[in-house]
């Protein structure tokens, strides 16, 4: 090994990665909100819809104060990977009624993938556990009917909206601890 030499700074550092994750999450939240509104316009929802395969909401307003960086990032990554799988499934199996929303769903999927990559990079730079906790992956079968796929889309977009909402709050809070 030669004499010590400095390395130039790379494009970002963990705090910049966290800033970027917040921006990406906010932008994804806006996209999701807009797409959910489009869904309600085209296919009015009769009450709240749920899907057993979706992750349960990780946080409530009351638990925000006790958040720890590793737990938040791991849980957010696991939940977003589940939502990504559901969006992919919607695009594949949603049927003709959802084909009109294909460009928006495609853009949503691309943004989700980008956010997941940013979270992974952040976890890598912080040397936090990368492995997602083992969770049973519920196989996603084809929707029972056209109405079934519409209800699933309402549930997926609604759940993703709530998840991203707590994610923005959580990530902003964690910024102060890094």
């Amino acid at each position: 090994p030669g004499p010590p030499a400095g390395s130039p700074r790379v494009s970002s550092d963990p705090r910049a990665d966290l800033d970027s994750a917040v921006l990406l999450t906010r932008s994804l939240l806006a996209d999701t909100r807009q797409l959910a509104a489009q869904m309600r316009d085209k296919f009015p929802a009769d009450g709240d819809h749920s899907l057993d395969s979706l992750p349960t909401l990780a946080m409530s307003a009351g638990t925000l104060g006790s958040l720890q960086l590793p737990g938040v990032l791991t849980r957010l990554r696991v939940d977003l990977m589940s939502y990504l799988r559901h969006v992919q499934w919607l695009r594949r199996a949603g049927g003709p009624s959802l084909k009109t929303l294909e460009p928006e769903l495609g853009a949503l999927q691309a943004r989700l993938e980008r956010l997941l990559r940013r979270l992974q990079l952040l976890m890598s730079r912080l040397a936090l556990p990368q492995a997602a906790p083992d969770q049973p992956v519920i196989p996603l079968g084809p929707p029972a009917s056209a109405w079934g796929s519409i209800r699933a889309a309402h549930a997926i977009l609604g759940g993703l909206h709530l998840t991203l909402d707590w994610a923005v709050r959580g990530l902003l809070l964690l910024k102060t601890r890094l």
Epitope: G6, R9, L121, L126, L178
Partner: antibody, heavy 114, light 111 residues
Framework: EVQLLESGGGLVQPGGSLRLSCAAS????????MHWVRQAPGKGLEWVSA????????YYADSVKGRFTISRDNSKNTLYLQMNSLRAEDTAVYYC???????WGQGTLVTVSS | QSVLTQPPSASGTPGQRVTISCTGS?????????VHWYQQLPGTAPKLLIY???ERPSGVPDRFSGSKSGTSASLAISGLRSEDEADYYC???????????FGGGTKLTVL
């Protein structure tokens, strides 16, 4: 400019111990996970150990588990590797690295030989 | 034997485009983990070349690019130059080892 400066390498007999240090400057040390990666003469890179930004998570390659201990002192911007029960196959240049790793030191040579 | 498999050597003439592959498994690249690439010039420490599959750190020329698909990744170098002669390593997190793993390295020769 980012600098990582390793020290503490040298010649040691099999079964002996060494403590490597890595002094960091030019970046926010406490915001980065840190790694030790080694390279035996003429061979490829082998990850050895890592520690999270705050020291709460530590990881080890199977080949060093139970013999090496990684630690850090964020107040001193320094990373450490305590190496015990050293073997001939531990002979290598040991690099300290930060982040992905994004930044690497120049390395310190550890020779285990009788 | 490395967890990530790379060809031991690759070569090309100045101006050419060369590609170096990195093949993993379902516990690393196939599990969705990002791939990073390092360049090690003779007698020096490794340097980050590509991170997160295809992102370049500042200062790395756009002749270097990365991609990932399924359980493998690749590094492409276009407009090959004599100063690109070096060892190239891929790396990714591995679930079964609970840590990052490196490929065995590819020695690139510019003819």
């Amino acid at each position: 400019e980012v600098q990582l400066l390793e020290s503490g390498g040298g010649l040691v007999q099999p079964g002996g111990s060494l403590r490597l240090s890595c002094a960091a400057s030019g970046f926010t040390f406490s915001s980065y996970g840190m790694h030790w990666v080694r390279q035996a003469p003429g061979k490829g890179l082998e990850w050895v150990s890592a520690i999270s930004y705050d020291g709460s998570y530590k990881y080890y390659a199977d080949s060093v588990k139970g013999r090496f201990t990684i630690s850090r002192d964020n107040s001193k911007n320094t990373l450490y590797l305590q190496m015990n029960s050293l073997r001939a196959e531990d002979t290598a240049v040991y690099y300290c690295a930060a982040g992905v790793p994004d930044y690497w030191g120049q390395g310190t040579l550890v020779t285990v030989s009788s | 034997q490395s967890v990530l498999t790379q060809p031991p050597s690759a070569s090309g003439t100045p101006g050419q485009r060369v590609t170096i592959s990195c093949t993993g498994s379902s516990s690393n690249i196939g599990a969705g983990y990002d791939v990073h690439w390092y360049q090690q010039l003779p007698g020096t420490a490794p340097k980050l070349l590509i991170y997160s599959n295809n992102e370049r750190p500042s200062g790395v020329p756009d002749r270097f690019s990365g991609s990932k698909s399924g359980t493998s990744a690749s590094l492409a170098i276009s407009g090959l130059r004599s100063e690109d002669e070096a060892d190239y390593y891929c790396a990714a997190w591995d679930d079964s080892l609970n840590g990052p793993v490196f490929g065995g390295g590819t020695k690139l020769t510019v003819l």
